[in-house]
């Protein structure tokens, strides 16, 4: 059998690892697999990173292909750009390296495409169908630090065997990510187990210094110690346990606190109790009991539905407002009667969608041209008086479903993985936080919470995306965004969905970056962040009344009042990119520094009668979708009467919205 296809392998540097998984997967499946291990599909943005990928992949067969983290939505060609309109699965287009197999051709690129790397030769980048199951995929894992591989000792029975936090076992590493375990076997029959841990003086290092296979007082049987044997001054020996274990009552053996820990899902040694519990992707710790895990509300993920979303355990449903119908993908909404030729290429359309769409949206964009921000970082807003924003729902849903505007929320790291900051290569001048948006967000990596930004590379108008600020603990009030208060009026028990409130989770001690807000039940009071408002428009913040027309039993009615939110601009440095294409000279682009006030969309109706878009999701032909691969599927429909808001160019509130169409999607997003 082919050695290339045998087992996963990895190559690690001091701050990241690339791992090759020779498993046949579609792009979506590969993306999921990397995320489940705490990483992302590989994003080789610099020649140095590409060199590490090259050495990892080696000289494979010409017929083999490996997914990397580049995808492009239909009709998003930008052939003059180094990435040609492709976006990294981390949500940006920053690169100082490309390796396209062919020069850009001027085709219309009608369908969505993903990029695979050739396993042979120059490891060129090829584009193709995202639904093809290619031969394997490359993951990338970022971490806070790494330990160098252990030096072989004279008394060793063989090379150290390393196990990484992403479950790769090998003897071939040069660097070991924080959280890795090294197992050393000695000729004398005993061995040692070491953990790559944080050092008191800073940085990371092995939990025990060498030599590991020498010593007399502890010979011949390691002094009877299961882990470490220490020779005291008076000649007697005492036993110690490696990090993450504690000495048992017999004083010799070591026990894993996680073996008895009552964690429902994942346990990590350490912490005041000797262990700490974590939840798998898609779950979060229960408020009342951190040992238990509760289902993540998918509707909190920005962009999971184009218009409205209802969560339930294990899945969610998308809905469209009156005058719009749900498209076949179960996510996007288009004006009623326009299903054949999608009238809006909106958020759902831009999620991994293989569909074609000939509609032009330039008019809709021009009508809203002032409302986007070039800030790729988090937008900080001055605190303002929170306006009243009362919601009244009367949905006919099962009791465990919650109609909500989608927002992101944190997930927790897997066992032995360090709390992470977003991985960025040397092309970026600072670590940059993820942008969160109610319309076109960039999702954070599952284990990479955002950090506070400094300066950011400028993005062109093509890549502007709306931004919502997340609220962060322990920051001066000047940097806290305004909060819009949302409250629900009481409903009969049979129809009342659980109420939600946005709250900011406690950070893990010592080294946790701020997380996104999660939403939790808190009586009937809901606090939620809404999109900011363009400075030149007074937003119409909506208040929901309890009175509903008899024709619309499941309707959502909004009343309006105005509030203004000030915004702070951010400066942005430049970025240079290079290309390693065998057929064209190096791309050299220089993006000038820019300082712009951030401007955000408010709730919008359709921008033009012929090209209607979501009332709450203004669209731009080149604005970036959330980087969530997804598969399409048929969707049941629910028709409901509600009046539509009249088209207008100025931002106004959504007058009335109903759950006009919905799609049940069980675990269809990631």
């Amino acid at each position: 059998q082919d050695p290339w296809a045998a087992e996963p392998r990895a190559a690690c540097g001091p701050s990241s690892c690339y791992a090759l998984f020779p498993r046949r997967r579609t792009f979506l499946e590969a993306w999921r697999a990397c995320r489940e291990l705490g990483g992302d599909l590989a994003t080789p943005r610099t020649p140095e990173e590409a060199q590490r990928v090259d050495s990892l992949v080696g000289a494979g067969p010409a017929s083999r292909l490996l997914w990397i983290g580049l995808q492009r939505q239909a009709r998003q060609c930008q052939l003059q750009r180094p990435l040609r309109g492709f976006t990294w699965t981390t949500g940006d287009q920053d690169t100082a390296f490309t390796n396209w197999a062919q020069p850009a051709s001027g085709g219309p690129c009608p369908a969505q495409r993903c990029v695979a790397l050739e396993a042979s030769g120059e490891h060129r980048w090829l584009e193709g169908s995202c639904t093809l199951a290619v031969d394997g995929y490359l993951c990338q894992f970022g971490f806070e630090g790494a330990c160098p591989a252990l030096q072989d000792e004279a008394g060793q029975a063989g090379p150290a065997v390393y196990t990484t936090p992403f479950h790769l076992v090998s003897t071939e590493f040069e660097w070991l990510p924080f959280g890795s375990v090294a197992a050393v076997q000695c000729q004398a029959g005993r061995g040692a187990s070491l953990l790559c841990v944080k050092q008191p003086e800073g940085g990371v290092g092995w939990s025990r210094a060498g030599p590991l296979c020498l010593g007399t007082g502890c010979s011949p049987d390691n002094g009877g110690c299961e882990h470490e044997c220490v020779e005291e001054v008076d000649g007697h020996v005492s036993c110690r346990c490696t990090e993450g274990f504690r000495l048992a009552a017999d004083g010799r053996s070591c026990e894993d606190p996680c073996a008895q820990a009552p964690c429902e899902q994942q346990c990590e040694p350490g912490g005041p109790q000797g262990y700490s519990c974590h939840c798998r992707l898609g779950f979060r710790p229960a408020e009342d009991d951190p040992h238990r895990c509760v289902d993540t509300d998918e509707c909190q993920i920005a962009g999971v539905c184009q218009q409205m979303c209802v969560n339930y355990v294990g899945g969610f449903e998308c809905y469209c407002s009156e005058g719009h119908e749900l498209e076949a993908d179960g996510i996007s909404c288009s004006p009623a009667g326009a299903m054949g030729a999608q009238a809006s290429q909106d958020l759902g359309d831009e999620l991994l969608d293989d569909g074609e769409d000939e509609e032009d949206e330039d008019e809709a964009w021009k009508a809203f041209n002032g409302g986007w921000t070039e800030m790729p970082g988090i937008l900080w807003m001055e605190p303002t008086q929170p306006p009243d924003f009362a919601l009244a729902y009367r949905p006919s849903f099962p009791e465990d479903r919650e109609p909500q505007i989608p927002y992101p929320e944190p997930t927790w790291p897997p066992p032995l993985s360090a709390p992470r900051v977003p991985y960025h290569s040397s092309v970026l001048s600072v670590t940059r936080p993820v942008v969160v948006s109610a319309t076109h967000p960039t999702l954070p990596s599952a284990h990479q919470p955002p950090v506070i930004p400094a300066t950011h590379p400028a993005l062109s108008r093509d890549h502007q995306i709306p931004v919502i600020a997340a609220n962060y603990p322990d920051l001066p009030s000047a940097y806290q965004p305004g909060i819009l208060s949302v409250s629900h009026s009481a409903q009969p028990p049979a129809h009342q969905p659980p109420m939600i409130s946005t709250k900011y989770p406690e950070l893990f001690p010592a080294h946790q970056s701020p997380m996104f807000p999660d939403t939790r039940v808190a009586g009937t009071q809901t606090t939620t962040h809404l999109p900011g408002i363009p400075p030149n428009h007074a937003p119409l913040v909506t208040t929901l009344g309890a009175q509903l027309p008899p024709q619309a039993p499941d309707a959502l009615v909004l009343r309006t009042q105005a509030t203004q939110l000030p915004i702070i601009p951010t400066a942005q440095p430049s970025l240079t990119t290079t290309s390693r294409s065998p057929v064209s000279p190096a791309h050299q682009i220089s993006v000038p520094a820019a300082t712009q006030p951030a401007a955000l969309p408010t709730l919008l109706p359709s921008q033009s009668p012929t090209n209607q878009t979501s009332p709450i999701s203004p669209t731009h032909p080149h604005s970036k979708a959330p980087q969530i691969p997804r598969e399409d599927g048929p969707s049941p429909k629910l028709a409901l009467w509600l009046p539509s808001p009249a088209p207008t160019a100025a931002p106004t509130a959504l007058g009335e919205a109903g759950l006009a169409e919905h799609s049940q999607r069980d675990d269809r997003w990631l």
């Epitope: 059998q1 082919d2 290339w4 296809a5 046949r24 579609t26 067969p61 010409a62 017929s63 083999r64 292909l65 396209w100 197999a101 062919q102 051709s105 009608p110 369908a111 969505q112 495409r113 695979a116 050739e118 042979s120 090829l126 584009e127 193709g128 169908s129 995202c130 639904t131 093809l132 199951a133 290619v134 293989d354 598969e631 399409d632 599927g633």
Partner: antibody
């Protein structure tokens, strides 16, 4: 130029076996997967399975599992397909086809070159 | 298994005509669709790959479009040598290829 040349026609009795060959030339044999496809009289094309000359990896259509075996002679750049326990409904033209890897910067798994076909007639 | 259904089964047209053949998949196959031309007694020839990309050497009058479940092969101006049987093929669940039943294009 790339060519796939298949062996001549075969007439077999029900229950017998047939083994046909597909000789490749004009490219590096181990770089491309070889698929086998058959077409009964007036029928649509039917995929039978593939063999990867790089590592001898094979995958067969469930319909033919247990009856079909695909092998290689790398030194002769030749792929073989054997079908056992023949029945009258196995009467068909059998094609070998090369799976493309990439065209003009695109990766794709369509079949870019085909052999001329081997007619197998199963009759008592 | 993914089924492919072509329509029509038979098509009569004249030289110079514009003809369209459609192929519908029983589930989403993205753009992993190819079109082949087969003449009597000959092996199929690749025309279009990845739903819309013309294979090297294929005349520009042949074009493909579609994604998801609905695909189209269009011949903009029929030439005498175009009368043949056309097959669509999906390979999204590679290596499990499936083919349509074929569309026979005849001279009117």
């Amino acid at each position: 130029q790339v060519q796939l040349v298949q062996s001549g026609p075969e007439v077999k009795k029900p229950g017998a076996s047939v083994k046909m060959s597909c000789k490749a030339s004009g490219y590096t044999f181990t770089d491309y997967v070889i698929h086998w496809v058959r077409q009964g009289p007036g029928q649509r094309l039917e995929w039978m399975g593939y063999i990867n000359p790089y590592d001898d990896d094979t995958t067969y259509n469930q319909k033919f599992k247990g009856r079909v075996t695909m092998t290689l002679d790398k030194s002769a750049s030749t792929a073989y397909m054997q079908l056992n326990s023949l029945r009258s409904e196995d009467t068909a033209v059998y094609y070998c086809a090369r799976r493309g890897n990439s065209y003009d910067g695109y990766f794709d798994y369509s079949m870019d070159y085909w052999g001329q076909g081997t007619l197998v007639t199963v009759s008592s | 298994d993914i089924q492919l259904t072509q329509s029509p089964n038979f098509l009569s047209a004249s030289v110079g005509d514009r003809v369209t053949i459609t192929c519908r998949a029983s589930q989403n196959v993205g753009t992993a669709v190819a079109w082949y031309q087969q003449k009597p007694g000959k092996a199929p020839k690749l025309l279009i790959y990845s739903a819309s990309n013309r294979y090297t050497g294929v005349p520009s009058r042949f074009s493909g479009s579609g994604s998801g479940t609905d695909f189209t092969l269009t011949i903009s101006s029929l030439q005498p040598e175009d009368f043949a049987t056309y097959y669509c093929q999906q390979y999204t669940n590679y290596p499990m290829y499936t083919f349509g039943q074929g569309t026979k294009l005849e001279i009117k």
